[in-house]
């Protein structure tokens, strides 16, 4: 008799999940020498042992906690790059910029990126049909716990002047509901950050409105200013430039705004 | 519930060298849980980290410090200390332990928990 299974709006387990895991965690751990000692055998068992057997629309952050700790890892504070609906960018700019990190750059967010996994309440198997919805479904589930644990720690950590890359082209540049919006603005620690910049990222080439006028961007600098953090914010016009420049920093165009 | 105090003298002359200790209680100093470190807030300023150590017992210093700056752990007395030597006016400031998790992502500068800070004066 086949089993009745829980049908959920989202997409089911990325195929190869355990495998894709460990295999990102031994890479991982032979890039980075301060994370050598990282048993990956012992990250991915705490791994699943955060959602496995769980009902995945009941995952708590305690859940994750024995994956949090053997995930610890030191960043510079004053090197975070944040970032909204403009993943790819942010990506290609600390991979440019070496001493720069964003959350993906960590084991932990390296680990997890663009993946999708929950189990089933009682069974010890990985749910590949589907996954709880955030929307559709319930905000409590194993993927969007595991985001909202790791990124309020990122930006708890913190300190001196913290950058956030936004996606101008979006109609909300700056959206209260996304990770940035909702987690990390308000988990960033006053008495360690001096400065939020905000990059706004251009999309069109032909745009040369002042994007840092948006009531989005205002709206920000509303909640930075509240939490007496100071806010700062520049247009990056041309980001294909940008990258370059970051590059190329003694390029003769360089100088000139990008 | 983890506490931290902070003891040491509150007046050092010029040129001679600070030294305080933290003293942990509700929870091992040796823990693999925790991470430790030292602030300073000199009067009207902000905030300043000093430096931290961690369980594998390496340390990370403010690089504008680290010439002057040793911190040091003492497990059998739950303790932590801060040396900073050659010290002037500029360094007059509360000075804080303070204690972080180790638990995901962090910084240098643990901020999960805090002493109630100590005034070190710098004057002859």
């Known amino acids: 008799v086949p089993r009745w299974r829980q049908q959920w709006s989202g997409p089911g387990t990325t195929k190869r999940f355990p495998e894709t895991v460990l295999a990102r965690c031994v890479k991982y751990t032979e890039i980075h020498p301060e994370m050598r000692h990282v048993d990956c055998q012992s990250v991915w068992d705490a791994f699943k042992g955060a959602f496995i057997s769980k009902h995945p629309c009941n995952i708590t952050e305690e859940d994750y906690q024995p994956l949090m700790k053997l995930g610890t890892q030191t960043v510079p504070c004053n090197k975070i790059l944040l970032w909204s609906r403009i993943k790819d960018l942010a990506h290609q700019f600390t991979q440019v910029q070496r001493d720069m990190f964003t959350l993906e750059d960590t084991l932990l967010g390296y680990l997890a990126d663009d993946l999708t996994w929950c189990g089933e309440f009682n069974t010890s198997k990985i749910n590949y049909q589907s996954c709880p919805d955030w929307r559709k479904d319930c905000s409590n589930n194993p993927v969007s716990v595991f985001w909202k644990t790791v990124s309020r720690r990122f930006a708890e950590a913190a300190c001196d002047v913290v950058h956030v890359m936004l996606n101008g082209s979006r109609s909300k540049i700056f959206d209260k509901n996304s990770t940035f919006g909702s987690v990390e603005v308000h988990n960033l620690q006053p008495e360690k950050v001096q400065t939020l910049e905000a990059w706004v990222i251009h999309g069109g080439r032909e745009d040369s409105r002042d994007l840092c006028q948006d009531p989005t961007i205002k709206e920000l600098e509303s909640i930075i200013s509240k939490r007496n953090i100071q806010f700062s914010c520049k247009n990056i016009y041309r980001p294909d430039k940008f990258l370059q420049c970051v590059k190329n920093p003694e390029d003769s165009s360089c100088t000139s705004e990008i | 519930q983890l506490q931290l105090q902070e003891s040491g003298p509150g007046l050092v002359k010029p040129s001679e060298t600070l030294s305080l200790t933290c003293t942990v209680s509700g929870g091992s100093i040796s823990s693999s849980s925790y991470y430790w470190g030292w602030i300073r807030q000199p009067p009207g300023k902000r905030l300043e980290w000093i430096g931290s150590?961690?369980?594998?017992?390496?340390?990370d210093y403010n690089p504008s410090l680290k010439s002057r700056v040793t911190i040091s752990v003492d497990t059998s007395k739950n303790q932590f200390s801060l040396k900073l030597s050659s010290v002037t006016a500029a360094d007059t400031a509360v000075y804080y332990c303070?204690?972080?998790?180790?638990?995901?992502?962090?910084?240098?500068?643990?901020?999960?928990?805090r002493g109630q800070g100590t005034l070190v004066t710098v004057s002859s």
């Open positions: 303070a204690g972080g998790y180790n638990y995901g992502p962090v910084g240098q500068w643990p901020s999960d928990y």
């Open positions: 150590i961690y369980y594998s017992g390496s340390t």
